[in-house]
Interface confidence: low
């Protein structure tokens, strides 16, 4: 008997969702002090078997009805007739003005119906069940809290569109508000919730609540049958009403394919064709870029970029324009490039600044520190595999084997090709000719160029920096010129036509001091390269007049801001006048110049480079660290 009662109770409780606490948010319910509480009679830990309210509902905010269980009367104990009394809380006091239910019939068994005459939307109600004069249950609520609209009616659907693949379709579902809901006058504002699922599925998919009576449902599978249902609730209060009758949606077959799993075959076909197409494109790319790939595998000699020259000119091989820029003077022969068939352009990558935490490869090659034993240079070598510009010269020298290692790195690392790092190297193709002899044309006439004195010179900001900031080297051995940077970088071309070179190393942290006693250093090179290739050390030996046993020390001026990109010759003079931050070295010690300008192009011998920022001890010199005049040049020429 008790089990039967429990089942009945659960059935009644399950049929009602009007008072399900989970469905009504606290914010909504807190609008009125006379809140209703979700009561599941069979689930309550209540020892009494008295009648309980199960549901109070208003379908349209104009009438309402309340229902209760009648457990006791199905048992052995008879407590007498069940009566419902109600009171409207429209007074300030706790009044006891109870009236009996106006209609026990209209809403069915164990119910009380309140028509519009007995319904007031704004006034809270309290209701109680009595038996033999004793209260067995009581609830309070406002009508707004118990609004549960009737189900939406007249559901239908229309096809919106079908996907290109014919796999999915979109539909528009429409319905009408319940007949008794006064939507037009705004007495009720309903929000709707649509749910749908495949016929064979158990879980409904819910869509977000909407205020309109139609909604699109997207991406339904073609050839599947769907169930759609809609329910509504009074906006901002109450609970969802019952669901509408289920609408069945069957989407017709619209594709020539008939596959279960989202038409697997066409997708596979697309993938196959895609892979094939990509492979073809890859082959085309590989064949068209054969030279690039060859250079990636066999990297070329690293050459710094030429500042002031559009890298695109170099990349596209437009030598005429490069020559025009470089050869502003009559003395320069443009035929130099255009006539020689062996001139080749090689794209190089300039190492990233963060990769330059070690010595420059020049320093390694020329270092007299034999204790440093490197297995290889450890830097990206740009040797293309053919004879490098200066390789024989370097190998000719009396370098210690520990210092040289290999001219080219065995490790071919992939090159990061920067847009502005496409550099020019003039390599020798003809292996039969001497690769290092008489490569420079003998047609060039000596030409003295006077630079503008006050022309600002840009500091090379992208040049890599060496970690060692001061290197002490004995110049007694002419090959020990590790502090002289052989990356002479063209940093500017003055309006007067001088090509201003700057070293690619040791210039980021600041300028070398100008206040030491300098020695004029001229570098000669047989294989005259218009770009910043290696100055061959063997040729340098022929041309550099060096005072014996003069110790060279490179000083970094830390007071110069790294962000000061342009430094004028005046600023160099100022720097020269400043006391050095390093210890003061004797007159016999000299800093290596950071800025060098081309003053004479000596036929075939090469260039005479002059230190711009260094005053000359015994000769007449400019007060500012500018360019050396012709007269001064004649004086200082050996």
């Amino acid at each position: 008997m008790d089990l039967w009662q429990l089942l009945l109770t659960l059935a009644l409780a399950g049929s009602s969702d009007a008072f399900s606490g989970s469905e009504a948010t606290a914010a909504i319910l807190s609008r009125a002090p006379w809140s209703l509480q979700s009561v599941n009679p069979g689930l309550k830990t209540n020892s009494s078997k008295e009648p309980k309210f199960t549901k109070c509902r208003s379908p349209e905010r104009e009438t309402f009805s309340c229902h209760w269980t009648d457990e006791v009367h199905h048992g052995t104990k008879n407590l007498g007739p069940i009566q419902l009394f109600y009171t409207r809380r429209n007074t300030q006091e706790w009044t006891q003005e109870w009236k009996e239910c106006p209609d026990y019939v209209s809403a069915g068994e164990n119910s009380c119906y309140f028509n519009s005459s007995f319904t007031s939307i704004w006034i809270p109600y309290c209701i109680k069940l009595t038996s033999n004069g004793g209260t067995v249950d009581e609830k309070c609520f406002s009508v707004d809290e118990i609004v549960q609209p009737d189900p939406p009616i007249a559901l239908n659907w229309t096809l919106l569109n079908v996907s290109l693949t014919g796999i999915h379709a979109d539909i528009q579902v429409r319905w009408e508000a319940p007949r008794n809901a006064d939507i037009q006058k705004g007495w009720m504002v309903l929000e709707y919730e649509l749910q749908y699922k495949e016929v064979n599925e158990t879980k409904w998919k819910m869509m977000d609540p909407i205020l309109t009576t139609s909604v699109p449902v997207y991406s339904l599978k073609v050839d599947k049958e769907y169930e759609v249902r809609v329910r509504s609730k009074q906006r901002n209060s109450g609970n969802y009403g019952e669901f509408s009758e289920v609408l069945y949606v069957t989407l017709p077959q619209m594709s020539q394919f008939t596959c279960e799993e989202d038409f697997y075959f066409p997708w596979l076909l697309i993938i196959i064709f895609g892979i094939f197409g990509l492979t073809v494109m890859l082959f085309v790319f590989l064949f068209s870029k054969q030279q690039r790939i060859k250079m990636l595998i066999l990297p070329p000699v690293p050459v710094p970029k030429i500042k002031g020259i559009d890298p695109d000119l170099l990349k596209e091989g437009k030598l005429e324009e490069v020559n025009t820029i470089l050869a502003i003077h009559d003395s320069y022969k443009p035929e130099f490039h255009s006539d020689d068939s062996w001139v080749e352009f090689i794209e190089l990558d300039i190492d990233e600044p963060d990769e330059k935490t070690e010595e420059s490869d020049t320093d390694r090659l020329l270092s007299s520190d034999h204790e440093k034993s490197h297995s290889n240079l450890g830097v990206k070598d740009g040797d293309s595999g053919r004879t490098s510009c200066c390789e024989p010269d370097i190998l000719e020298t009396d370098f210690n084997a520990n210092d040289i290692h290999e001219g080219t790195s065995e490790v071919a690392q992939p090159q990061r090709l920067k847009g502005e790092a496409d550099l020019l190297c003039l390599d020798q193709k003809n292996q039969n000719n001497s690769p290092y002899h008489d490569a420079c044309p003998a047609t060039q006439q000596p030409s003295v160029i006077q630079a503008e004195k006050n022309k600002p010179q840009p500091l090379p900001t992208e040049g890599a920096e060496s970690t060692h900031q001061a290197a002490h080297i004995q110049l007694s051995n002419p090959s020990s010129l590790s502090n002289i940077d052989f990356y002479a970088q063209v940093s500017d071309i003055t309006p007067a036509g001088s090509v201003v070179l700057s070293p690619g190393q040791k210039n980021k942290a600041g300028m070398s001091q100008c206040d030491m006693h300098p020695e004029m250093v001229s570098l000669c090179q047989e294989n005259f390269l218009m770009d910043n290739a290696y100055f061959c050390e063997a040729d340098a030996k022929k041309c550099i007049p060096v005072a014996p046993h003069i110790k060279v020390e490179s000083h970094i001026q830390p007071s110069l801001n790294q962000e000061d990109i342009y430094i004028t010759t005046e600023s160099l003079t100022t720097a020269a006048g400043r006391p050095g931050t390093g210890e003061h070295v004797p007159g016999s010690e000299m800093p290596v110049p950071d800025y060098t300008s081309i003053h004479i192009v000596q036929s075939p011998q090469g260039l005479i480079l002059n230190a711009t920022a260094l005053p000359l001890p015994d000769k007449e010199f400019l007060s500012s660290c500018g360019y050396v005049s012709t007269d001064q040049l004649n004086k200082i020429m050996p």
Epitope: A18, F19, S20, G21, E23, A24, T25, A26, A27, L29, S30, R31, A32, P33, W34, S35, L36, Q37, S38, V39, K44, T45, N46, F53, K55, C56, T87, R89, Q92, W94, Q96, W122, P124, C126, K128, G134, T135, V136, D137, E138, K139, C140, F141
Partner: antibody, heavy 124, light 108 residues
Framework: EVQLVESGGGLVQPGGSLRLSCAAS????????IHWVRQAPGKGLEWVAS????????YYADSVKGRFTISADTSKNTAYLQMNSLRAEDTAVYYC?????????????????WGQGTLVTVSS | DIQMTQSPSSLSASVGDRVTITCRAS??????VAWYQQKPGKAPKLLIY???SLYSGVPSRFSGSRSGTDFTLTISSLQPEDFATYYC??????????FGQGTKVEIK
């Protein structure tokens, strides 16, 4: 986070007046029922008054009817208890509390959040 | 007004004991009864509402039940933090609120 903070308590002579404030945060006083409950030293809890701002209903215990007035300023989210004609027996810690809305159907005016209380001492 | 008679007024118990506190309403209040715990100098805390519903965050060792006009609060296994004073409250919508006089649970 729901919080209630009472203020305005103090020492007052018999026959005097005092206004207690209950500042609410974390919920809207407009849609809630605010109650005042007091506790005399060493005694039990005694319900004093309540207000349901949404409907404008106010309720009082018989012991304070006519002397105490409960009100609310919804713009300040604060409830007040104006106490006039105070007596010695009104000496107590006054708590404001919020009625717990269980939602749905089984109505019960339980008080879920309480303030820390403010002491009112009526003495000559 | 409905009177709530709470018993016992005090009791001594040990940790782990099962404790039962009873409240009797002077007339039918349906299930509109709540139980509170109060510690000295603190505000009351809601434990049970609607006679038998456990308030959120309250340990499950607390439970409430109703038999007619008798309402019971049970602590299944008393814990050290449970030593406090417990109040019942009738919250019938048709009557002014009334509290029981309280039951003080002390350590034996």
């Amino acid at each position: 986070e729901v919080q209630l903070v009472e203020s305005g308590g103090g020492l007052v002579q018999p026959g005097g007046s005092l206004r207690l404030s209950c500042a609410a945060s974390g919920f809207n006083v407009s849609y809630s029922s605010i109650h005042w409950v007091r506790q005399a030293p060493g005694k039990g809890l005694e319900w004093v008054a309540s207000i349901s701002s949404y409907y404008g209903y106010t309720y009082y215990a018989d012991s304070v009817k006519g002397r105490f007035t409960i009100s609310a300023d919804t713009s300040k989210n604060t409830a007040y208890l104006q106490m006039n004609s105070l007596r010695a027996e009104d000496t107590a810690v006054y708590y404001c509390a919020r009625r717990y809305w269980m939602g749905g159907y089984a109505y019960s005016m339980a008080l879920d959040y309480w303030g820390q209380g403010t002491l009112v001492t009526v003495s000559s | 007004d409905i009177q709530m008679t709470q018993s016992p007024s005090s009791l001594s118990a040990s940790v782990g004991d099962r404790v039962t506190i009873t409240c009797r309403a002077s007339q039918s209040v349906s299930s509109a009864v709540a139980w509170y715990q109060q510690k000295p100098g603190k505000a009351p805390k809601l434990l049970i509402y609607s006679a038998s519903s456990l308030y959120s965050g309250v340990p499950s060792r607390f439970s409430g039940s109703r038999s007619g006009t008798d309402f019971t609060l049970t602590i299944s296994s008393l814990q050290p933090e449970d030593f406090a004073t417990y109040y019942c409250q009738q919250s019938s919508s048709t009557q002014p609120f009334t509290f029981g006089q309280g039951t003080k649970v002390e350590i034996k």
